[in-house]
Amino acid sequence: PKQTLPKPIIRAESTYMVPKEKQATLCCQGSYGAVEYQLHFEGSLFAVERPKPPERINGVKFHIPDMNSRKAGRYSCIYRVGELWSERSDLLDLVVTEMYDTPTLSVHPGPEVTSGEKVTFYCRLDTATSMFLLLKEGRSRDVQRSYGKVQAEFPMGPVTTAHRGSYRCFGSYNNYAWSFPSEPVKLLVTGDIENTSLAPTDPTFPDSWDTCLLTRETGLQKDLALWDHTAQNLLR
């Protein structure tokens, strides 16, 4: 069987939701010593980066300027050490936002609720769209989808303080082209005695996994890597 290197990790820097005409940055984190990284879009080669010097950095950044609907879709990356290629990374969905119009978001019974009440978000957008998306700030990976002609509903079940936070919705013209975001709706949940101390409000900074953690190798890391390599050989 053909030998391959472990798959790299692909991430979007700051967010996978990129406003049209803005720059998207994707990171591919592979291995020290990788001489080439390839970015693939919808299965085809999209860009190539060669780190300098390859042995001192464990990944690269791919800059995608002037984001538009043609560049929105599924990305993956691979890397090469010598003649050996890695497995393909997981797929990353890159979305273009700020297309066309702005939806409105409403919440029933209202933005201030008590624990145990059932809440429904309603997203409305008059221009032709069939899919709507609801996102909670600080939880942008947890996208809820709903369908409707001009509006869609997002029932939330009995709420707890874990539901507190800011919500926005988008209309979607396809999976990767979204509208402008709605104005945020801040949901306040009170009276959850059992959970209050355990459920702080969600952070308002971007999702922690939407950051590129590319590191330059230090002398110490090199010594550790060499020690690890020697230890592995001894074990063999």
Partner: antibody, heavy 115, light 107 residues
């Protein structure tokens, strides 16, 4: 204080339409849902639908989808419900109720459908 | 649609008596339940929201509670103005639905 003003009565002919009004005061009209509720003489209450004045989101009881149309005029803080193709079954008191949890109620408009 | 079964449909009681009205929900509604009072002239007023929260200006003799799918309105000591109609209302799942009502009469 919060007030929802509705006309006392409307007399309409079978087959005609009527547009009921509900003028809100004492709160931020655009921030809260407005519901409409039907009560037939000596009967219980039935929810017709609701509208959010700010977003224009409407939600109807399927039973009333072809009967009622909800609209708002933000400039006058007034909600409207148009009832079409009226029959004797539509003779009832119609209430508007402000806030998602039905906190504030109008006095109701008695609609009588009669030739 | 969620059915709200309200009982009793009518109740005779005396001044100062403690009474409880009940609504049973056919599906889970969480705490999304109101109790409303309707005067003989048709005026409707909300007494309780979110199962047990008392509206401002409503006398403390009114209280709301829940046990499973049963929701109760209790009046601890009846006064003359309490002999009117009462309705429960669920706002958990659209269409929002009302109980059939309870007519509270003086004995």
């Amino acid at each position: 204080q919060v007030q929802l003003q509705q006309p006392g009565a409307e007399l309409v002919k079978p087959g005609a339409s009527v547009k009921l009004s509900c003028k809100a005061s004492g709160y931020t009209f655009t921030s809260y849902w407005m519901h409409w509720v039907k009560q037939r003489p000596g009967q219980g209450l039935e929810w017709i639908g609701m509208i959010h004045p700010n977003s224009g989101v409407t939600k109807y009881n399927e039973k009333f989808k072809s009967k009622a149309t909800l609209t708002v005029d933000k400039s006058s803080s007034t909600a409207y419900m148009q009832l079409s193709s009226l029959t004797s079954e539509d003779s009832a008191v119609y209430f508007c109720a402000g806030d998602g949890r039905f906190a504030y109620w109008g006095q109701g408009t008695l609609v009588t459908v009669s030739a | 649609d969620i059915q709200m079964t309200q009982s009793p449909s009518s109740l005779s009681a005396s001044l100062g008596e403690r009474v409880s009205l009940t609504c049973r929900a056919s599906q889970d509604i969480g705490s999304s339940l109101n109790w409303l009072q309707q005067e003989p002239d048709g005026t409707i007023k909300r007494l309780i929201y979110a199962t047990s929260s008392l509206d401002s200006g409503v006398p403390k003799r009114f209280s709301g509670s829940r046990s499973g799918s049963d929701y109760s309105l209790t009046i601890s000591s009846l006064e003359s103005e309490d002999f009117v109609d009462y309705y429960c209302l669920q706002y958990a799942s659209s269409p929002w639905t009302f109980g059939g009502g309870t007519k509270l009469e003086i004995k």
